[in-house]
């Protein structure tokens, strides 16, 4: 999974439906494969905010040991810190599982920064603000990591629900979701409501408020408005999309469109930042430069490497552009835009400047590895990871942080052509895709 | 080459309103995207930042002033001005203007700074 | 808020010794620190920025280094005219706002 700006994710926990709540619309849409309608028990299942990652919690064993999880579209294994470690506060002792079975085999993930490494095994596997169900699933008991558990995060492990290409050691390792819906009638289908809160969090505040909802097996319609539109899923590995167009405030960045999606475009609740690749970041920091010309900001910034800070209240949101990403829709030649505020991409830091400030990171960054729709972009979204169809649905998010003037948007369609062209086809090589 | 001259009364009474204006000479404010700041030293004491402003006019204040402090700028007259309100004995310092320079991050260029004592 | 703590508070040091000076900000600054130094009567002069780069026209005999949480300014070998107080000044939050309390460095 993609790291760096890449899980573990970085800075505070928490993020509650805050901010100015749209208001319902009612739209019909197509039959949805599974449940539809409400799921009380699993909305709010959801802690944690974009620095750090979103967690939900989980029961791993018998008698169930509870652990907090990390929610991560953007890789496959369900792996568990097993033993002490200075961040964590709890961890899975297999020896106190009557269940535990040990599969002898080890597995290492390394990434660009940090690593994990751990045994493989399995056991009983259930998520109490999920579906009343209990699976038997792979786990990987870390033993060791560097740079991978992050200090007052809050979780202790990470929930992999990307397909089993990527999962490690090899895609013989069954991903946690593929044993889900064999073993029960969960649909093969799930959702994720991401809340940023908008300003930032304190451990307390964090551990106390809600992040948002992870609706396994269906789509809440509590927790979105207007209506969903879906974009084919490329291929079952991450979750691969195409990106077709991308505008700053409505002006076209006119790139040959497979330039967005090189080598790939995923969507990934496990990296904090909208990641770009090197040619699509300069252009579009080029562009969102020009269009919040009235002030000047330090390259550091636009590198986040350094914050900007305003009053408490003042954030001159206005003079931050709109980024629209044009997705490939279901129908021929027909294309739909998501659309995110300055809100999700100037990232709230907690801790830094005066109480009186309120201070921001530049949640969009350079990539080597292609596109990555992370917190920063499904924090303004209601997503659906509609497995059986082979397709991702975005509809605008009930808790998405925004003003008075403009809020995010799902809209469509829009007549498109030659969109199968902008996919990029990576060549086939045996190349670690974690090592980015 | 680039210089900031500051000027304004050395004496202002309690409860009155500091008026200082920095001179940009050598250089012109409007075509160039540097911030401008006032910082202040009290006698005998370290730097405070007081504010800064770009040239299109957006401000930047210390949260612990912003309430009295206003900074704007007059790109025909390559000046830039600081109004500190309701004066006391605790605002004596020596004021200095400055360029925020080396990528905006730095106060590369200094004025002499002037000194203003707050006394009746 | 960042705070930035320099010490020692004063050094007293012999022309041709090696001063260091030490600023620790409160929490990671990155690279984002400055030096300055001020003589009686002028106004602060920049030496270093970025925490090790030198400003034009600055000697060498001036270096900075550290990132993070702690900085150091070394001046290798006191010339005269060095005698003044140094402040360090962060730019992780932006604008640039917040010194250091300053060290002033003595003839002993």
């Known amino acids: 999974t993609q790291h760096g700006i890449r899980l573990p994710l970085r800075s505070g926990l928490g993020g509650a439906p805050l901010g100015l709540r749209l208001p319902r619309e009612t739209d019909e849409e197509p039959e949805e494969p599974g449940r539809r309608g409400s799921f009380v028990e699993m909305v709010d299942n959801l802690r944690g905010k974009s620095g750090q990652g979103y967690y939900v919690e989980m029961t791993v064993g018998s008698p169930p040991q509870t652990l907090n999880i990390l929610v991560d579209t953007g890789s496959s294994n369900f792996a568990v810190g097993a033993a002490p470690h200075p961040f964590l506060h709890r961890y899975y002792q297999r020896q106190l599982s009557s269940t535990y079975r040990d599969l002898r085999k080890g597995v290492y993930v390394p990434y660009t920064q940090g690593k994990w490494e751990g045994e493989l095994g399995t056991d009983l596997v259930s998520i109490p603000h999920g579906p009343n169900v209990t699976v038997r699933a792979n786990i990987a008991a870390i033993t060791e990591s560097d740079k991978f558990f992050i200090n007052g995060s809050n979780w202790e492990g990470i929930l992999g629900l990307a397909y089993a290409e990527i999962a490690r050691p090899d895609d013989s390792l069954e991903p946690f979701f593929d044993s889900l819906v064999k073993q029960t009638h969960v649909p093969n289908l799930f959702s994720l409501q991401l809340c940023g809160a908008g300003f930032p969090l304190n451990q307390s505040e964090v551990l106390a408020s809600v992040g948002g909802s992870m609706i396994i097996g269906g789509i809440d319609h509590s927790l979105y408005t207007g209506s969903l539109w879906y974009t084919p899923i490329r291929r079952e590995w991450y979750y691969e999309v195409i990106i077709v167009r991308v505008e700053i405030n409505g002006q076209d960045l006119k790139m040959d469109c497979k330039e967005y999606n090189y080598d790939k475009s995923i969507v990934d609740s496990g990296t904090t930042n909208l990641r770009l690749p090197k040619k699509v970041f300069e252009a579009a920091v080029k562009s969102i430069k020009a269009a919040s010309s009235t002030e000047k900001f330090p390259d550091g910034f636009w590198l986040g490497e350094q914050l900007v800070c305003w009053q408490a209240g003042t954030t001159p949101w206005n003079i931050f552009p709109v980024i629209s990403l044009y997705l490939m829709g279901e129908v021929t030649n027909q294309s739909f835009r998501i659309t995110i505020l300055p809100q999700q991409y100037l990232r709230p830091v907690e801790d830094v400047a005066t109480s009186q400030d309120d201070c921001y990171k530049f949640a969009i960054s350079q990539s080597s590895t292609g596109t990555v729709m992370g917190a920063v972009i499904m924090e303004g979204f209601y997503v659906v990871f509609d497995r059986a169809r082979k397709r991702i649905g975005f509809a605008v998010s009930a808790c998405h942080v925004h003003d008075e003037f403009r809020t995010a948007a799902v809209e469509g369609p829009f007549v498109t052509l030659d969109m199968e062209d902008c996919g990029y086809n990576i060549p086939q090589t045996d190349e670690s895709t974690l090592m980015t | 080459q680039l210089q900031l001259q500051e000027s304004g009364p050395g004496l202002v009474k309690p409860s009155e309103t500091l008026s200082l204006t920095c001179t940009v000479s050598?250089?012109?404010?409007?075509?160039?995207?540097?911030?401008w700041s006032w910082i202040r030293q009290p006698p005998g004491k370290g730097l405070e930042w007081i504010g800064s402003?770009?040239?299109?006019?957006?401000?930047y204040y210390n949260p612990s002033l912003k309430s009295r402090v206003t900074i704007s700028v007059d790109t025909s007259k390559n000046q830039f001005s600081l109004k500190l309100s309701s004066v006391t004995a605790a605002d004596t310092a020596v004021y200095y203007c400055?360029?925020?320079?080396?990528?905006?991050?730095?106060?590369?260029?200094w004025g002499r700074g002037t000194l203003v004592t707050v006394s009746s | 808020e960042i705070v930035l703590t320099q010490s020692p508070a004063t050094l007293s040091l012999s022309p041709g010794e090696r001063a260091t000076l030490s600023c620790r900000a409160s929490r990671s600054v990155n690279s984002y620190l400055a030096w300055y130094q001020q003589k009686p009567g002028q106004a602060p002069r920049l030496l270093i920025y970025d925490a090790s780069k030198r400003a034009t026209g600055i000697p060498a005999r001036f270096s900075g280094s550290g990132s993070g949480t702690d900085f150091t300014l070394t001046i290798s070998s006191l010339e005269p005219e060095d005698f003044a107080v140094y402040y360090c000044q962060q730019v992780y939050t932006w604008p640039p706002r917040t010194f250091g309390g300053g060290t002033k460095v003595e003839i002993k």
């Open positions: 050598g250089g012109s404010i409007s075509w160039s995207s540097y911030y």
């Open positions: 402003i770009y040239r299109s006019g957006r401000t």
């Open positions: 400055a360029r925020v320079g080396h990528g905006i991050n730095y106060f590369d260029l």
